[in-house]
């Protein structure tokens, strides 16, 4: 099946043609391409309206399309292997004729997530609804079809042909027929604008009654961006009608002579062009030559004009269009500069906030300020950041390094600090000794005391507590107490000896723990250290550190 009936709309510098026919997207593109065009782009709301107009024209000619929901291919496609990209307005699709991606889109529904298959876009028309400018055809994506299998509901396609410029339609001053033949092989007798290089065939007369005269014209570029037919005066003029037929073919005023002849004229402020039919404004700004928000400013004596841009924009190379000035090129900001349409804005890096002397300046955020500190203990503000610190006996913890955690000096790196028993406390530690040993004045070592199997000596008084630094006591290995039969901790049986020479073996009698002074009902389980171990720190021997035991005073203690 080929492409059948066609409709055409020309506007600006492009013509759109609509064709009915069940073709694959590739066949449709080939059809457009043979005549020098491509499947149509729909890059703006305005262009969508032009395409809608040509489709409406086609639908008026078509008796009945086979599907209520009809689809017409346009030139938006995604090649095989290119994935859907939800972050882009065109979702990873691109226009077949090339050109930049534009922000306008009108997707019918969420797109199918795929990469392998080539995907093509069609305009979805609900033929049960009138085509209204406010209800533009939606974009529907799907497989691109294949010869003989165009895809579901495909009824045709829309082509677009671009030109250097357009001629005005020829004006007839009397009965006759104009037939335009465009470079894309479409013939039409009614075009709002006629593309460059089109031919016009004018047959004057009223059919059988008069002899018909034929004229042939070509739309040419007379001067840069000036296109006309090279004809002078109205065509098919007839003394019989004078100015009464189609205003004599004149653009504005028609003046009749006594002999039935007539001339075209123009209203004040306009002048007659070389075709002796068309009027153009004497004010060069009246044709709105400036684009993109540019204002047209008349030159001296109203002869020429210049375009002026609003603040934050500058003229492009054509001197007709405004483009955004990238103010960030001049580094106006202290830290980050973000260019915006018609301006810019300054932003500050993380850890800084707007402020300080000068425009776009940034000042350090004091994260350690009162009521703002993220740190559990110490907080030091730095330029653009901060860091947390902990008091002696604590180390930084937490994923973000803002929390402080007690250092258990009894199991610390490099081995324990006590020669024998070690009691960890919040931010510190105390040493103790096994039965028969007493704590030396340094608060760390144990010396031989009177032989006894009583309880271990408790922690020293505050002034005797173990120093965190500068200890000369050898590092000892750790063996945590294990759970006894009644839930009481017991020392792991061993024949190792404390570092001070002695022949008295350490017994495996259960140890009753003394509470540290000043906290009678609360105690910490000691770690038992044997300084004779040569291998350095070892893994704890599976102790359960959350055991509650009966204290000497009969109260329940808990770690």
């Amino acid at each position: 099946t080929g492409a059948d009936t066609e409709a055409v709309v020309c506007v600006g510098t492009a013509c759109y043609t609509a064709h009915s026919g069940k073709l694959s997207a590739a066949e449709a593109q080939n059809h457009c391409n043979q005549n020098g065009g491509n499947l149509a782009t729909v890059k703006s709301k305005e262009e969508a309206q032009h395409v809608q107009r040509v489709l409406a024209q086609l639908l008026r000619r078509e008796a009945a399309l086979t599907a209520r929901m009809s689809k017409f291919w346009i030139g938006l496609q995604r090649e095989k292997g290119k994935c859907l990209d939800p972050s882009l307005p065109l979702k990873g699709f691109s226009w077949v004729g090339g050109g930049e991606d534009t922000p306008y889109s009108n997707w019918h529904k969420e797109l199918r997530n795929s990469c392998i298959s080539k995907r093509c876009v069609s305009l979805l028309l609900d033929l049960s609804q009138p085509l209204l400018p406010s209800r533009l055809p939606k974009w529907s994506e799907g497989p691109c079809g294949s010869p003989g299998s165009p895809g579901s509901n495909i009824e045709g396609f829309v082509c677009k042909f671009s030109f250097k410029g357009m001629c005005r339609p020829l004006a007839l001053g009397g009965p006759g027929q104009v037939t335009y033949t465009t470079p894309f092989q479409t013939t039409s007798s009614s075009l709002e604008a006629v593309p460059f290089a089109s031919a016009a065939n004018v047959a004057c007369g009223e059919g059988d009654k008069d002899e018909t005269q034929s004229h042939y014209f070509l739309c040419k570029e007379k001067a840069p961006d000036v296109f006309d037919w090279g004809s002078s005066g109205p065509l098919c003029v007839s003394p019989k009608y004078g100015c009464n037929f189609n205003n004599g073919g004149c653009h504005q005023d028609c003046f009749e002579g006594g002999d039935g002849s007539f001339l075209c004229g123009c209203r004040p402020g306009f002048r007659l062009l070389d075709d002796l039919v068309t009027c153009a404004s004497r004010n060069p700004c009246s044709s709105s030559p400036c684009r993109g928000g540019a204002t047209c400013v008349l030159g001296p004596h109203g002869k020429n004009y210049t375009c002026r841009c609003p603040q934050g924009y500058q003229l492009d190379s054509s001197q007709l269009d405004c483009v955004d000035v990238d103010e960030c090129q001049d580094s106006p900001c202290a830290q980050e500069c973000v260019n915006t349409p018609g301006g810019f804005r300054c932003e500050c890096w993380v850890g800084y906030e707007p402020g300080g002397p000068g425009e776009g300046a940034c000042q350090d955020v004091d994260e350690c300020a009162l009521g703002r500190s993220p740190c559990a203990q110490g907080c030091t503000n730095t330029d653009g950041s901060f860091h947390c610190s902990c008091e002696e006996g604590y180390v930084l913890a937490g994923e973000d390094g803002t929390q402080c955690q007690d250092v258990d000096e009894c199991v610390g790196p490099g081995g324990p600090l006590c020669d024998s028993l070690c009691f960890n406390t919040q931010g510190s530690f105390h040493c103790g000794c096994l039965p028969g040993w007493v704590l030396a004045p340094n608060g760390v070592s144990c010396t031989m005391g009177p032989v006894s199997l009583g309880p271990p000596s408790g922690p020293p008084d505050e002034e005797d507590k173990g120093e965190k630094e500068g200890s000369t006591v050898p590092r000892a290995a750790t063996a945590s107490p294990t759970r006894g039969p009644e839930g009481t901790p017991k020392a792991t049986p061993t024949t190792s000896r404390p570092s001070l020479s002695s022949d008295a073996p350490i017994t495996s009698a259960p140890l009753k723990m003394l509470a540290p002074s000043g906290s009678p009902g609360v105690w910490r389980e000691p770690s038992i250290h044997h300084a004779t171990a040569a291998s350095g720190p070892q893994e704890p021997a599976g102790g359960d550190s959350s055991v509650a035991t009966q204290n000497n005073d009969g109260t329940d203690g808990q770690k």
């Epitope: 095989k80 997530n113 392998i116 298959s117 497989p143």
Partner: antibody
Framework: QVQLVQSGAEVKKPGASVKVSCKAS????????MHWVRQAPGQGLEWMGG????????AYNQNFKGRVTMTTDTSTSTAYMELRSLTSDDTAVYYC?????????????WGQGTSVTVSS | EIVLTQSPSSLSASVGDRVTITCRAS???????LHWYQQKPGKAPKLLIY???NLAFGVPSRFSGSGSGTSYTFTISSLQPEDIATYYC?????????FGSGTKLEIK
């Protein structure tokens, strides 16, 4: 929820062919592409190819030099991967996988794997 | 085809450690198309991070990713025992999709 259930382990002779199936459930089968990835013992992951069940279009890794064919049966929501002219180098676990609602080929759903042993 | 080189090929770390794996591409890869997977022995790979830095559903926040162009990084902020696995990066910038060589992570 999306589930991909693969056929059982296979033992094949060199030169033979193997056809592994992957039955999908929990979504509209034609909505997502299906891909196949294999892993030889102690080795990394190797993409073999994929198929779009809506169109039947395929994309294959050229390393398989025309030995692989991927097909789908939309009536049973099943994808198939056939590998021909097997050698011992094809001994691997074969996975079917797709990217569900994620974009950019981030493979979110995986079958449990099918072990294929090629041995004489 | 784009070759992804992971380093190190294996590493041993302690529970609580910060672990970083690097994935280098033989030519530039769009950050949208770079993903990370975890594979435990005898199991199918599991998507952890998609499009360089987005956490897949149900993945703990200790996993993160960053990078652009030809250099991408995967990080575990505080290693947990259950993180013992092999980690793979994967890219797509035209067929074939390719995976990195893998990084085997062990606990000290």
């Amino acid at each position: 929820q999306v589930q991909l259930v693969q056929s059982g382990a296979e033992v094949k002779k060199p030169g033979a062919s193997v056809k592994v199936s992957c039955k999908a459930s929990g979504y509209t089968f034609t909505d997502y592409e299906m891909h196949w990835v294999r892993q030889a013992p102690g080795q990394g992951l190797e993409w073999m190819g994929g198929i779009d069940p809506e169109t039947g279009d395929t994309a294959y890794n050229q390393n398989f030099k025309g030995r692989v064919t991927m097909t789908t049966d939309t009536s049973t929501s099943t994808a198939y991967m056939e590998l021909r002219s097997l050698t011992s180098d094809d001994t691997a676990v074969y996975y079917c996988t797709n990217y569900g609602n994620l974009y950019y080929y981030a493979m979110d759903y995986w079958g449990q794997g099918t072990s294929v042993t090629v041995s004489s | 085809e784009i070759v992804l080189t992971q380093s190190p090929s294996s590493l041993s770390a302690s529970v609580g450690d910060r672990v970083t794996i690097t994935c280098r591409a033989s030519s530039s890869v769009s950050s949208s198309y770079l993903h990370w997977y975890q594979q435990k022995p005898g199991k199918a790979p599991k998507l952890l991070i998609y499009s360089t830095s987005n956490l897949a559903f149900g993945v703990p926040s200790r996993f993160s990713g960053s990078g652009s162009g030809t250099s991408y990084t995967f990080t575990i902020s505080s290693l947990q025992p259950e993180d013992i696995a092999t980690y793979y990066c994967q890219q797509y910038s035209g067929y074939p999709l390719t995976f990195g060589s893998g990084t085997k992570l062990e606990i000290k």
